[in-house]
Structures are given as C-alpha cells and as structure tokens.
C-alpha cells in the first residue's frame, strides 16, 4: 500500500479507564506541519477542532483535547484525523474511553494506561472539507 | 451515488481501465473508495480501495502488480488492469464506504461492470 | 494475509425459521466487520457494520454478534424474501495489516 499522509495515533492520558469527575486528555499525533487536529467521537458528525498544535519531535507534531471533568456521556470511541494542506489524512484507530463510578476521588489514580496503535481499535469513515479544515460546520456536534 | 464504466469484451493478455465516477458527494470528504469484483456465479472478491483525501491506497495481495487503484479527478477513480486472463472475467463493482457509520462499511455500491476475457 | 472463513456454505430453512451464518477471522480485526445481502443480478445491500450496529432501513431481524475473532449474523423469523447470498467482509485498511477481504459467502435457500 501507499501511504502519501502517514496514519495519526491517538493517546489518552492518564488512560482510557477514568473515574466520574476526573480529567482526560486525548493526545492527537501526526507528522510535521500539521495545521489542524480534529478528534472525532463515534461517527465523523462528532467532532472538535483545534490548531493549537505543537511540535512533539522534529518528525511529530500533536495537539492535545483535554475534557476536564468527565461525564458518563464521555464513554465511547474516539479518532483523530488531521489536515495537512491540501489534504485530509485517514483516521487513527479508535480508542475507547470508560468512564466508571469514582471510588477514590477526582485524582483517583486507578485509571489504565491508554493508545491505540493497530487494529485491535480500529480507523473508520472519514468526512471532511479539504478546504476549510476549521469547524466550518459538516453538521457538526461538539464533544464537550 | 457511483456508477461503473469501461466494461468490454477484450483478448487475453489485454488492458483495460475502468472508471468509477461519484455524484452528490465530494472525494475532499475523504472516503476509501473500493474495487471488488465478483466472477459469474461467484463470491465477492476485494481488489483494493483508494482514500479519496489522503491517497492512500490498499490492494488485496493478489492484486499488487496488475492492478492499479488512482483518484484521477475530483469526481473520478479508476481500477486499470494488465496481463488479463480469462479468470478476470467478472462483473467489477466501485463502492464508497459510508457517510454517517463507522468501521468503513460499504454502504454505496455501483451497478458494476461486465469485464470479459476470451479470445 | 487476513483471511475470513464463512460457514455455511449453503442452508436451506423454513418461512419463519431461524438461521445462524458464522465468520471466522484468521487474526483480530476488532469490530471491523460487516455483512452484507445479495440477491442474484444485483449489487450487495449492507446489513449490518461494525460487527453489531444495523444499517439503517434494516429489518430488526437481522442480528450481527461478536465473540473474539468470530462473527455471527443472525436471521430470525425468515421470509421467502430474505433467500440470497449473504457475505461478510473485514472493513479494516491500513498498515498493521490489509483487511477488505470477503468470506465465501453462504446462499440461503428458503423452503
């Protein structure tokens, strides 16, 4: 196969298992010169924007989505994709966020380490203007 | 909706280019778009697909080589194919994977195409 | 290379019987998997995707289940309608492996 954009992963920190309350980022990577990270829940509708995006590695760049206090509703799949101009990438993989009854308080450390890297999550559709990489609408739904 | 043309009766060792031309959707969306054919009375067989945005391509292993996946226009993918042998002879579908589901189901599907090889 | 092994080949059962169709995967694909319908002279029809979620516009009858790296769609109280060939197909494209690869299919005769 032929890959003209390498294929984003996406992370979650402190993991992808997070007490009601608590925080979570998700870490969106890609290579260099990315000028938009979208990360997208469930179906491509779903989704939030950002082009706060960082150099990770001469060779990496990410953008980080941090939810600050997670909700049952949070639960679910998460991807991202990113524009590079002039084009959209495929998907990341998905990665599962659970979201369970805090048993230790908001800091709660019993959470599980969190990214996705193969199928064992999964890439999927893919929905996305190559010229207007910002939230310019696609019947969009923000996540939080 | 995607719609199949350049179905022909050629000679073995032949090549033949099939299009797939998409209306009411954009190929900047992002969509893997997919050639699978299907022998007569057989099953369906995947050849490959093409992400419409990004360009990345995948083709089933037996069809590195003689087959070839490209985006050739905003609105046209085609599947262009070397070295035919009579067990090419199959009806070649286009399908896009799908607008509002994940995992990349192939939610819309061509007509198809005849392609037959024989002397 | 992925492969998905379809069982049955073909089956035949009566109006308002139930049938069980299993595809096996030769390695995990999570729930990159769908199954589609097809009927003679005609493009296949999407039932089911993402292992279990039913395509909209999908009688309610057709189930699709998960169980490690076997897939099961179901058909419940059949219709002479519902006689076609039926495939499932891994959904996954990328660089840890190549999916896209159909099972043999399994034709439904209904008596």
């Known amino acids: 196969q032929e890959e003209d954009l390498p294929r984003p992963s996406i992370s979650a920190e402190p993991g992808t298992v997070i007490p009601l309350g608590s925080h979570v980022t998700f870490v969106c990577r890609g290579p260099v010169g990315v000028q938009t990270f979208r990360l997208e829940r469930d179906s491509r509708s779903t989704y939030n924007d950002t082009e706060d995006v960082s150099q990770a590695s001469p060779s990496e760049s990410e953008a980080r989505f941090r939810i600050d206090s997670v909700r049952e509703g949070n639960a679910g799949l998460y991807r991202c994709i990113y524009y590079k101009p002039p084009k959209w990438s495929e998907q990341s993989d998905y990665l599962e966020l659970l979201v369970k009854e805090s048993s230790g308080g908001p800091d709660s450390p019993d959470t599980e380490p969190g990214s996705s890297a193969g199928p064992t999550q999964r890439p999927s559709d893919n929905s996305h203007n190559e010229h207007a990489p910002a939230s310019q609408g696609l019947k969009a739904e923000h996540l939080y | 909706s995607v719609k199949e043309s350049g179905g022909d009766l050629v000679k073995p060792g032949a090549s033949l280019t099939l299009a797939c031309t998409a209306s009411g959707f954009s190929f900047s969306d992002g969509y893997y778009m997919c050639w699978v054919r299907q022998a007569p009375g057989k099953g369906l067989e995947w050849i490959g697909c093409i992400h419409s945005s990004s360009g990345s391509i995948y083709y089933a292993s037996w069809a590195k080589g003689r087959f070839t996946i490209s985006k050739t226009s905003s609105t046209m993918v085609t599947l262009q194919m070397s070295s035919l042998t009579a067990a090419d002879t199959a009806t070649y579908f286009c399908?896009?994977?799908?607008?509002?589901?994940?995992?990349?189901?192939?939610?819309?599907w061509g007509p198809g195409t005849l392609v037959t090889i024989s002397s | 290379e992925l492969d998905l092994t379809q069982t049955p080949a073909s089956v035949s059962e009566a109006v308002g019987g139930t049938v069980t169709i299993k595809c096996q995967a030769s390695q995990t694909i999570s729930n990159y998997l769908a199954w589609y319908q097809q009927k003679p002279g005609q493009r296949p029809k999407l039932l089911i995707y993402a292992a279990s979620s039913l395509a909209s516009g999908v009688s309610s009858r057709f189930r699709g289940s998960r169980s490690g790296t076997e897939y099961t769609l179901t058909i419940t109280d059949l219709e002479c309608d519902d006689a076609a060939t039926y495939y499932c197909?891994?959904?996954?494209?990328?660089?840890?492996?190549?999916?896209?690869?159909f099972g043999g299919g399994t034709e439904l005769e209904i008596k």
């Open positions: 197909q891994c959904t996954y494209y990328g660089t840890t492996y190549v999916g896209g690869a």
């Open positions: 399908a896009r994977d799908s607008e509002s589901y994940g995992y990349n189901p192939c939610e819309l």
